[in-house]
Interface confidence: low
Amino acid sequence: KSSNEATNITPKHNMKAFLDELKAENIKKFLYNFTQIPHLAGTEQNFQLAKQIQSQWKEFGLDSVELAHYDVLLSYPNKTHPNYISIINEDGNEIFNTSLFEPPPPGYENVSDIVPPFSAFSPQGMPEGDLVYVNYARTEDFFKLERDMKINCSGKIVIARYGKVFRGNKVKNAQLAGAKGVILYSDPADYFAPGVKSYPDGWNLPGGGVQRGNILNLNGAGDPLTPGYPANEYAYRRGIAEAVGLPSIPVHPIGYYDAQKLLEKMGGSAPPDSSWRGSLKVPYNVGPGFTGNFSTQKVKMHIHSTNEVTRIYNVIGTLRGAVEPDRYVILGGHRDSWVFGGIDPQSGAAVVHEIVRSFGTLKKEGWRPRRTILFASWDAEEFGLLGSTEWAEENSRLLQERGVAYINADSSIEGNYTLRVDCTPLMYSLVHNLTKELKSPDEGFEGKSLYESWTKKSPSPEFSGMPRISKLGSGNDFEVFFQRLGIASGRARYTKNWETNKFSGYPLYHSVYETYELVEKFYDPMFKYHLTVAQVRGGMVFELANSIVLPFDCRDYAVVLRKYADKIYSISMKHPQEMKTYSVSFDSLFSAVKNFTEIASKFSERLQDFDKSNPIVLRMMNDQLMFLERAFIDPLGLPDRPFYRHVIYAPSSHNKYAGESFPGIYDALFDIESKVDPSKAWGEVKRQIYVAAFTVQAAAETLSEVA
């Protein structure tokens, strides 16, 4: 049940009052306001929007709203020297050039400062050479190329289709394969849903549309020049050569019209199987190089982007808690966009704005939350989660002592089919209970709960009658809070039907066509899905900030720890002989999980029975719950990834967007059969089992009776 207990309030000021105050019409109005011009990080337009949000949050009634600025490394195209790709003949003449910009959408023809498509942080360069098609440029795609097909990408320019994994992983894989340039493109197989028209007549990607995005491999570092520390006025900055995560080869994105021109001439090897074929009318030959008459033609990249240290601005709003002001519940989402940000991020920012307005309304009527709520409008998320990470680095000591939870609020929608939630297991019960109280916005579920429609449309693969909740990965602003600091985190948005729509993300992601009209005409005309997401995000924040006992259930962590231990054990058991040879045992991990399960169960029993009127005991129990997520942090971090410190979850080493469980063990086991020194490799597996077992046991002990 929701708890109504907060201080200095009349009975009406409960969760229901907060939820009833949220209005779809307001979200629509805010979205329109936030999407009329581009708000690229580091630009004057985005600074002005920061000041507008600061002013409006103050009007809404927050106790304080401040701008927090940092000077970080950003990347922009050269305005007078555009980036493009050409096909050159044997004389070096350019016989085909890719587009320099996307055709602007109707009504936006006269908007200035639309940044042309580019891969942020690409180095400058003009490499030329033969093309190799590398499918999605995943780890397994390069295994297929190099090991099975014996294709050497060294000295080649590779062309990869967007989708499946974070683009930075694609570039890293290409670099490791020896490529000298990367072309990224959107294939209709991934970004054009069958039976839907392209924008402006539908929500599909037109042939001239291009996905922008950063191609860093930061592994949680934040600003590439100041890893671990805030990029403030007295920061000591690394040189570009020592910067974290920058790519070493030129990279550029294109649309499928331009990709067609490059791919139709490809020769060399046929695609290994149908999974390498997209939907263009080309053979999807792997190469290297062009076929037959075109074999003397080469591809040349012309990349002239520059990296610049630029000022960015976060907006931080505070609603002080009445009882525990030193306990922070944070709701944050980014403000910067690649162009108009119709979905990413402004569909999220508009929801945050309305949540702030609702909380402010309650506060003006005399209500305060039990705990402090912090609201954040992050800058430079698109350039590597920079705003959130720098702020968390600056405030890390406060956050690790006082941070209860972080709720992320980027795009509210990526479809309009059902809810999608990724969160710590501590929040499973909170999400279940909350969604049972909310009405479903879905057609055919009138009068039914959100929990019911969500469970029907997205069932849990493990537990019948429950909805799917996914692991947190990365690629968004919760990363520093969860993966580095160990603050319980969650995110929620409305999503597509993954079973029928196989395209990656949503088709117009990071393109100029991500406009207000895209949302208002095609995704959510009534803004009912936005409202539902506001209710979920806002409702979670309300409960986390207001319930007397924190709404965390440690027993759910016990369940997943067992599942993850079983999974990693089964991966290891694919090598039974080596496990025997090198005496690899998971007994310590399973024992720790068993102990955790028993201690969590006893803790939950005590949680039901203790005297909630005793503020000292209440605070003690709540602290045990708050610090449980923190207990999974290893101060030394994961191997070669010091800012990923959570032992149970980390972003996959092969796809930043995806979460991996027991990542230390997983990475130690990955491709272990190819390691040159098996004894050393299996030794590292044993070390990682030891670290995981110790961490689970140590976390369990934080839940034991204190004396």
């Epitope: 397994e140 097909m149 020769g267 046929a270 695609p271 199987d273 999974s275 030959n285 037959g292 074999s295």
Partner: antibody, heavy 115, light 107 residues
Framework: EVQLVQSGAEVKKPGATVKISCKVS????????IHWVQQAPGKGLEWMGN????????TYAEKFQGRVTITADTSTDTAYMELSSLRSEDTAVYYC????????WGQGTLVTVSS | DIQMTQSPSSLSASVGDRVTITCRAS??????LNWYQQKPGKAPKLLIY???TRHSGVPSRFSGSGSGTDFTLTISSLQPEDFATYYC?????????FGQGTKLEIK
Amino acid sequence: EVQLVQSGAEVKKPGATVKISCKVSGYTFTEYTIHWVQQAPGKGLEWMGNINPNNGGTTYAEKFQGRVTITADTSTDTAYMELSSLRSEDTAVYYCATGWNFDYWGQGTLVTVSS
Amino acid sequence: DIQMTQSPSSLSASVGDRVTITCRASQDVGTALNWYQQKPGKAPKLLIYWASTRHSGVPSRFSGSGSGTDFTLTISSLQPEDFATYYCQQYNSYPLTFGQGTKLEIK
């Protein structure tokens, strides 16, 4: 050591269907495409199609399209080739092969189609 | 479909001879070409891939060359165990296609 072990010889009547298995060992099954190749008595090699066991993606030669179905069972590390509407000219040895360069081959399965 | 034509269809040679088999593609296949050896009652064995790269364990007397449409397999000094049928195969585009084979017999 990579091994591909195929099911035994079959005698079928015209119009019938044959299903041949190919059990692999010595590598992770989902890592390599599996191809099927036909060789009629005294004749050359003819590629029939392939499957990516990782996702079930298949590609078939036009000559066999509609009659051939290639499947893979990742739980048993086994690939299957089913050929329907058999005729006398389908009498042949059928091979499975794996690795993009057809590095490893099964021992072959003789299918005789006779009334 | 890409047609692969081998020549000769058969040839007789003696131990120690140098033998060359050619394979012609009906259209450009780059260097996406394999050579196989097959003995009676046995499965084919990969000899050469990417037109000129010897598969592991293949003796150095076997070599491949060519690109585009014309390819050759050369056996520098025939050994008794080399008498077999040899096939080329393109993997530039689907359907993957084989040559009709060259039968190498003892003179």
